[in-house]
C-alpha cells in the first residue's frame, strides 16, 4: 500500500505565439481545480476508461477575475497535493491523465458550471520511494508544470511497496526466516499482510492482499463456515455429490453489487463499496454529477450538485455523445460543394476549393473569364469552374498562345496532302478529287461540280478554294 502524490506548480499559457484567452472574465469569474487519473501499465486506454489505480480531485483554487487587456497569466492554483492512495503493490509503470477544470462562478441559479480547460496524458516508469520527478506537459496553448512521486505507507517498503518492515523485537536479530530490512537495518521484514478483513483464525495468505481459507471455511474473508453433513471424508471437504461438506451460500456469492461495486461480508449480511458515481445498497443508483467531471473534450457540464440531479454535456464543435466522448467525422456529410476538399480542423471545418470556386463551402462559382485574356484573337468560354479559350484559326493551347499546326487534324479528305500556309492550310488533292478539303469527286465525264480551275492550275495541283 502507498500513496501517489502530485504537486501542480503552474498552469498558464505556454511559450510561443497564440496565447490563450483567459478562462475567466469580469462577467464570469472562475477558479481552477485539477483531477488526476492513474492506470497501471503503459496502457493507451481511452480517457473514459476506469482509473484502475485510483483518481483524485484537488481543492478549488482561489477565485480569479481577468484584468481587461492583460494577457492570461499563470492562473492561481489550489493549495496542497493531490493524493491517490493505492492498496496493492505499486506497478512501477503507469499511465496518467491530469485534467484542468474551470468552475464558473457567475450568477448561475443552478449552481456553478464546470468545463474542461485542458487535459494532458502520459506514460511513465516510476519506482516507489524515489525522489520527486518533475514534468512539463502542453495541451494546446496551455502549459502545465508538475512533480510527482510514489511513496509506500508503513509498514510497506521497496520499489513496489510489497516488502513489509517492522521494528525489531530483539535488539540483535530478526525472527526466524525474516531478514533485516535494507536500508532500515534496525527493522525486520514482517510477515505478509493479508487482505483487509481476512479472518485471522480461519484465513492465511502467501501473497500480500490474499485471503486463503483453512479447511471448513469459505467466503472472500474466510468467515463463512462450510455446512457439514453427517459424514466427513478423511481427506477433508469432498464434492457436493457425496453429501459431505458442501460450502454454504455466502452473502457475496454471485456478487450482488452492480456497476463494478465490490462486495464484503458483514456479520449479518453484505456491504457494497461502490465506485464513484454510484450509490445505493447494491450500487444500483447512478449518482454522477458535474462534480465528477463527466464531460470530455472540453464539453461544458450542466447539472445540479445533488446526486439525484441529471446532467448534460454541452459539446464543442466536432464532438458528440452523452459525454462529448465521440469525435464527429464532419467531412462524412460532404459539406464542400463543387468538388472542394474537406478538412476537419477540430475547432472548425475548412473547404479547399477547386479553381473557379470560392466561399466557406465552395458554393460560389467565380466568373471564370474575369481577368483572363485569350491571346491572338481567341474568345473566353466559361464553364465547370475553369475557363476555356476558343482560339482563332492557326492558334491553340489553353490561352491561344501556341501556334497551331493546321494540318495536325488531317483535314484533307480522300488522301489529299496538307500544307501549312500563313493564311491557313492548303490541300493538294489526289487525282479525281477537288475542293478546299478535297471533299468533292471530279465527275466521270471530266466536268466538275465546281467552277473550272483557274488558269495556271492543273487538276492535280493544290486547290485554294478557301
Amino acid at each position: 500500500a502507498g500513496v501517489f502524490e502530485l504537486q501542480i506548480h503552474s498552469f498558464g499559457p505556454g511559450p510561443g505565439p497564440g496565447a490563450p484567452r483567459s478562462p475567466c472574465s469580469a462577467r464570469l469569474p472562475c477558479r481552477l481545480f485539477f483531477r488526476v487519473c492513474l492506470k497501471p501499465g503503459l496502457s493507451e486506454e481511452a480517457a473514459e476508461s476506469p482509473c484502475a489505480l485510483g483518481a483524485a480531485l484537488s481543492a478549488r483554487g482561489p477565485v480569479y477575475t481577468e484584468q481587461p487587456g492583460a494577457p492570461a497569466p499563470d492562473l492561481p492554483l489550489p493549495d496542497g497535493l493531490l493524493q491517490v492512495p493505492f492498496r496493492d503493490a505499486w506497478p512501477g509503470t503507469f499511465s496518467f491523465i491530469i485534467e484542468t477544470w474551470r468552475e464558473e462562478l457567475g450568477d448561475q441559479i443552478g449552481g456553478p458550471a464546470w468545463s474542461l480547460l485542458a487535459r494532458v496524458a502520459g506514460r511513465r516508469r516510476l519506482a516507489a520511494g524515489g525522489p520527486w520527478a518533475r514534468d512539463i506537459q502542453r495541451a494546446g496553448a496551455w502549459e502545465l508544470r508538475f512533480s510527482y512521486r510514489a511513496r509506500c505507507e508503513p509498514p510497506a517498503v521497496g520499489t513496489a511497496c510489497t516488502r513489509l518492515c517492522r521494528p525489531r523485537s530483539a535488539p540483535s536479530r530478526c525472527g526466524p526466516g525474516l531478514r533485516p530490512c535494507a536500508p532500515l537495518e534496525d527493522e525486520c521484514e514482517a510477515p505478509l499482510v493479508c487482505r483487509a478483513g481476512c479472518s485471522p483464525e480461519h484465513g492465511f495468505c502467501e501473497q500480500p492482499g490474499e485471503c486463503r481459507c483453512l479447511e471448513g471455511w469459505t467466503g472472500p474473508l474466510c468467515t463463512v463456515p462450510v455446512s457439514t453433513s453427517s459424514c466427513l471424508s478423511p481427506r477433508g471437504p469432498s464434492s457436493a455429490t457425496t453429501g459431505c461438506l458442501v460450502p454454504g451460500p455466502g452473502p457475496c456469492d454471485g456478487n450482488p453489487c452492480a456497476n463494478g461495486g465490490s462486495c464484503s461480508e458483514t456479520p449479518r449480511s453484505f456491504e457494497c463499496t461502490c465506485p464513484r458515481g454510484f450509490y445505493g445498497l447494491r450500487c444500483e443508483v447512478s449518482g454522477v454529477t458535474c462534480a465528477d467531471g463527466p464531460c470530455f473534450n472540453g464539453g461544458l457540464c450542466v447539472g445540479g450538485a445533488d446526486p439525484d440531479s441529471a446532467y448534460i454535456c454541452h459539446c464543442p464543435p466536432g464532438f458528440q455523445g452523452s459525454n462529448c466522448e465521440k469525435r464527429v467525422d464532419r467531412c462524412s456529410l460532404q459539406p464542400c460543394r463543387n468538388g472542394g476538399l474537406c478538412l476537419d480542423l477540430g475547432h472548425a471545418l475548412r473547404c479547399r476549393c477547386r479553381a473557379g470556386f470560392a466561399g466557406p463551402r465552395c458554393e460560389h462559382d467565380l466568373d471564370d473569364c474575369a481577368g483572363r485574356a485569350c491571346a491572338n484573337g481567341g474568345t473566353c468560354v466559361e464553364g465547370g469552374g475553369a475557363h476555356r479559350c476558343s482560339c482563332a484559326l492557326g492558334f491553340g493551347g489553353r490561352d491561344c498562345r501556341e501556334r497551331a499546326d493546321p494540318c495536325a487534324a488531317r483535314p484533307c479528305a480522300h488522301g489529299g496532302r496538307c500544307y501549312a500556309h500563313f493564311s491557313g492550310l492548303v490541300c493538294a488533292c489526289a487525282p479525281g478529287y477537288m475542293g478546299a478539303r478535297c471533299e468533292f469527286p471530279v465527275h466521270p465525264d471530266g466536268a466538275s461540280a465546281l467552277p473550272a480551275a483557274p488558269p495556271g492550275l492543273r487538276p492535280g495541283d493544290p486547290q485554294r478554294y478557301l
Epitope: Q108, G110, A113, L300, V302, I312, C313, H314, C315, P316, F319, Q320, G321, S322, C324
Partner: nanobody, 115 residues
C-alpha cells in the same frame, strides 16, 4: 434581456399527468443545450431532464420512466411530459437553455401534486 416563458403547471392529484411547455422563443434552437430544472422549498435547484446540443437526453434518477423531455426545433419550443406524478415532484419548474457563452432561464411554473 430575453427570458424564457414556462406554462402548463398547476395542481394535480398523485398519479396524474401534466405537460409543461417553454417558448416559443428564438433562444430554443438546436445548437443550444436545454432542460428543465426544479426547486422544492428549502432545497437546491436540480436538473430534472435535459437535451444536449448534440441530442443526448438525460434524466434525474427519481423521474426516469415517468418524465419525457422533447423539443420542437421548428417551433422553438421545449416540453416536459410528466406522468405518474408523486407528491415529491412538487416544486417550481424552470425552463433553461445555454450555449458556451450564455445561459437563459425562465421565471418558473409551480407544480403541486396532492397525495
Amino acid at each position: 434581456e430575453v427570458q424564457l416563458q414556462e406554462s402548463g403547471g398547476g395542481l394535480v392529484q398523485a398519479g396524474g399527468s401534466l405537460r409543461l411547455s417553454c417558448g416559443p422563443s428564438e433562444i430554443i434552437t438546436s445548437d443550444k443545450s436545454v432542460g428543465w430544472w426544479r426547486q422544492a422549498p428549502g432545497k437546491q435547484r436540480n436538473l430534472v431532464a435535459g437535451i444536449s446540443n448534440v441530442g443526448s437526453t438525460n434524466y434525474a434518477q427519481s423521474v426516469k420512466g415517468r418524465f419525457t423531455i422533447s423539443r420542437d426545433n421548428a417551433k422553438n419550443t421545449l416540453f416536459l411530459q410528466m406522468n405518474s406524478l408523486k407528491p415529491e415532484d412538487t416544486a417550481v419548474y424552470y425552463c433553461y437553455a445555454r450555449d458556451f457563452e450564455n445561459e437563459y432561464w425562465g421565471r418558473g411554473t409551480q407544480v403541486t401534486v396532492k397525495p
